[in-house]
C-alpha cells in the first residue's frame, strides 16, 4: 500500500505566494485552536509518543514545543480535566544525558520542572497542573502545533549548515 | 498510567482568526525545491533517523513519503553525488514484521525494492541509484517534504486524513 498522503491545504508558516499578495494572517484548520501565534490540536485519541510525533508530522505540524513558563501556563489553562495528559515534543536523550526538545534544543534548567525519571525511553507529558515523564510507549493524548505567523522574507537554514 | 479521556479540552471553533482572501497558489519556502506537488528539503547535515523525523516535524513537514517508482526516480535524479544517502520516512515495524511508512501505511511489494536487512531498528535511505536499509542510529542526511496544493477558502480537514 502506498503512503496515502492527504494534501496539505495550507502551509501556515513558511510558504510564500508567487503572484498575489499574501494576507497578514491565516486561520487555524478545523479541530485546531488558535493560541497566541500558534494553532494547537489537542488530540482526543491516544498514542505512544513516537506515533504522536509521526501523526503531527504527517499533519505537517510538530509535537508541542513550549518556549517558556507563560506558554506552559497558557496551554495548561486549556486542559479542563485534571485526569487528562498530553504528550509534548520533549524526551530524554540517553547519549546526551539531557532532556531534548524535538527541534534539537536542550531543556533549560529555568524552564519546565519535570516530575519523574530522566532515563532511556522517557518522554514528557503535561497535565492541568504539572509536567511529568513517562515511558514513551505509554498511550496518551498529544498536542500538535503549527506556527501562525507573518511571512518572513528570509527563512534561517540553521539546521542545514 | 491509563489516560482518561475526560472532558474535551478545547473548543474546536473558538478563537478563529479573521482572514482576508487567500491567494490561489503557494510556493516553496526558501531552501526548499518544488518537485511536482511537493516541496522537498534535502538536508546538508546528518542525523540518526529519529532525529531526522523530529527535525522535519519541527519544520512542519514530514520525512519523505514516496508514492511510487516514478516519484522515487524523480527524487533520485536530484541527488547529484553517488556517495550521498538520505533517510526517508520508512522503517521496519518489528511488531508488524513489515516496512511501515511514518503515516502508518505499509510498503507494498510493488513499490520500492529495499536492499538490506528487514529487522528491528532498520530504517530506509535512498541513494542516487538504490534504496537501502540501515541501523536507524546511523547518521545520514535526510529529506523533508511539504505538500504543495491549491488553497481552498475554507480550510478542510480532508488534508488531515
Amino acid at each position: 500500500q502506498k503512503p496515502s498522503i492527504g494534501k496539505c491545504s495550507v502551509d501556515i508558516q513558511q510558504n510564500r505566494t508567487k503572484t498575489t499578495e499574501r494576507p497578514d494572517l491565516l486561520n487555524c484548520p478545523i479541530y485546531w485552536q488558535q493560541v497566541q501565534e500558534k494553532c494547537l490540536l489537542f488530540s482526543h485519541t491516544v498514542n505512544p509518543w513516537n506515533n504522536s510525533l509521526a501523526d503531527c508530522s504527517t499533519k505537517e505540524s510538530s509535537l508541542l514545543l513550549i518556549q517558556d513558563k507563560d506558554e506552559l501556563t497558557r496551554t495548561q489553562n486549556l486542559i479542563h480535566d485534571k485526569a487528562i495528559s498530553f504528550w509534548i515534543g520533549l524526551n530524554f536523550s540517553l547519549s546526551e544525558k539531557n532532556w531534548k526538545w524535538i527541534n534539537g534544543s536542550f531543556l533549560s534548567s529555568n524552564d519546565l520542572k519535570i516530575t519523574g525519571d530522566a532515563k532511556e525511553n522517557s518522554c514528557v507529558y503535561i497535565s492541568q497542573t504539572s509536567v511529568y515523564s513517562e515511558y514513551c510507549s505509554t498511550e496518551m493524548k498529544w498536542i500538535c502545533q503549527k506556527e501562525l505567523t507573518l511571512v518572513r522574507n528570509k527563512v534561517s537554514p540553521d539546521s542545514w549548515l | 498510567q491509563k489516560p482518561s479521556i475526560g472532558k474535551c479540552s478545547v473548543d474546536i471553533q473558538q478563537n478563529r482568526t479573521k482572514t482576508t482572501e487567500r491567494p490561489d497558489l503557494l510556493n516553496c519556502p526558501i531552501y526548499w525545491q518544488q518537485v511536482q506537488e511537493k516541496c522537498l528539503l534535502f538536508s546538508h547535515t546528518v542525523n540518526p533517523w529519529n532525529n531526522s523525523l523530529a527535525d522535519c516535524s519541527t519544520k512542519e513537514s514530514s520525512l519523505l513519503l514516496i508514492q511510487d517508482k516514478d516519484e522515487l526516480t524523480r527524487t533520485q535524479n536530484l541527488i547529484h553525488d553517488k556517495a550521498i544517502s538520505f533517510w526517508i520516512g520508512l522503517n521496519f515495524s518489528l511488531s508488524e514484521k513489515n516496512w511501515k511508512w511514518i503515516n502508518g501505511s505499509f510498503l507494498s511489494s510493488n513499490d520500492l525494492k529495499i536492499t538490506g536487512d528487514a529487522k528491528e531498528n532498520s530504517c530506509v535511505y535512498i541513494s542516487q541509484t538504490s534504496v537501502y536499509s540501515e541501523y536507524c542510529s546511523t547518521e545520514m542526511k535526510w529529506i523533508c517534504q511539504k505538500e504543495l496544493t491549491l488553497v481552498r477558502n475554507k480550510v478542510s480537514p480532508d488534508s488531515w486524513l
Partner: antibody, heavy 121, light 107 residues
C-alpha cells in the same frame, strides 16, 4: 477503494459467543482509532467500543463491559469484536466505523455495511 | 455519560420545505457535535462535524449551527433524497453517544 467490510455475524443462542471482523482497505488503517457501533432492529445508533490506533487503549459502553473485547491487527488491516455471554438485547446490526481525523475517536466518515447478529434460542 | 435529546422525533414535510432538527446535550460539549443521515438498510452517512463543518460531498442545503448544549441541523430546501432518519452524535467525551433520531417523512 476506501471501504470497511464486516463479517462474522449470524444466529447464536443466549450465552453464546461470536467474533466479528472488519477488513479495512483504501486508507491507512493503523493511523486511526476505530469503533464498533450497533443498531437494534427499528432502533437508534449505539456506540459499543473503541480502540486506539496502536491498539493499547480500549473503551466500552457499560452495556457490553466485561463481555465484549475489541482488538485489532494492524498488519492485517483488520478490526475485531469478540462477543461473549451474548444476550437477546445484543441483537443488532454491528457496524465498524472510522473517524474523519486521526486525532479523534468519533466523527465517523466511513462505515461498513454492517453485519447482523441475532441472539435467540 | 452525556445524553443527547433530539427533537422532534419525526417531522412530515414536503419537497422544497425548510426543515430544522434540534439536538440538546445534557452538559456543554463546545462544538463537538456531528450529524448523520441514515436511510433504511444502509449505514449512516456523515453530514456535519464540529457542529457546523460540512462534510466533503454533502450538498450545501445542509447546515449545522450551535455550541455548548444546543445544536441545530437545517435542510434549507428539502429534496426527495433527503427523506431519511437523522442522528446527532457528541464527540466531546467517551462514551460516544447518539441522539434518538429524527425521522423526516413525506407529507
Amino acid at each position: 477503494e476506501v471501504q470497511l467490510l464486516e463479517s462474522g455475524g449470524g444466529l447464536v443462542q443466549p450465552g453464546g459467543s461470536l467474533r466479528l471482523s472488519c477488513a479495512a482497505s483504501g486508507f491507512t488503517f493503523s493511523q486511526y482509532a476505530m469503533s464498533w457501533v450497533r443498531q437494534a432492529p427499528g432502533k437508534g445508533l449505539e456506540w459499543v467500543s473503541a480502540i486506539s490506533a496502536a491498539g493499547g487503549t480500549t473503551y466500552y459502553a457499560d452495556s457490553v463491559k466485561g463481555r465484549f473485547t475489541i482488538s485489532r491487527d494492524n498488519s492485517k488491516n483488520t478490526l475485531y469484536l469478540q462477543m461473549n455471554s451474548l444476550r437477546a438485547e445484543d441483537t443488532a446490526v454491528y457496524y465498524c466505523a472510522k473517524p474523519l481525523d486521526s486525532s479523534q475517536w468519533a466523527d465517523f466518515d466511513l462505515w461498513g455495511r454492517g453485519t447482523l447478529v441475532t441472539v435467540s434460542s | 455519560d452525556i445524553q443527547l435529546t433530539q427533537s422532534p422525533s419525526s417531522v412530515s414535510a414536503s419537497v422544497g420545505d425548510r426543515v430544522t432538527i434540534t439536538c440538546r446535550a445534557s452538559q456543554g460539549i463546545y462544538s463537538w457535535l456531528a450529524w448523520y443521515q441514515q436511510k433504511p438498510g444502509k449505514a449512516p452517512k456523515l453530514l456535519i462535524y464540529a457542529a457546523s463543518s460540512l462534510q466533503s460531498g454533502v450538498p450545501s442545503r445542509f447546515s449545522g449551527s450551535g455550541s455548548g448544549t444546543d445544536f441545530t441541523l437545517t435542510i434549507s430546501s428539502l429534496q426527495p433524497e433527503d427523506f431519511a432518519t437523522y442522528y446527532c452524535q457528541q464527540a466531546s467525551d467517551l462514551p460516544i453517544t447518539f441522539g434518538g433520531g429524527t425521522k423526516v417523512e413525506i407529507k
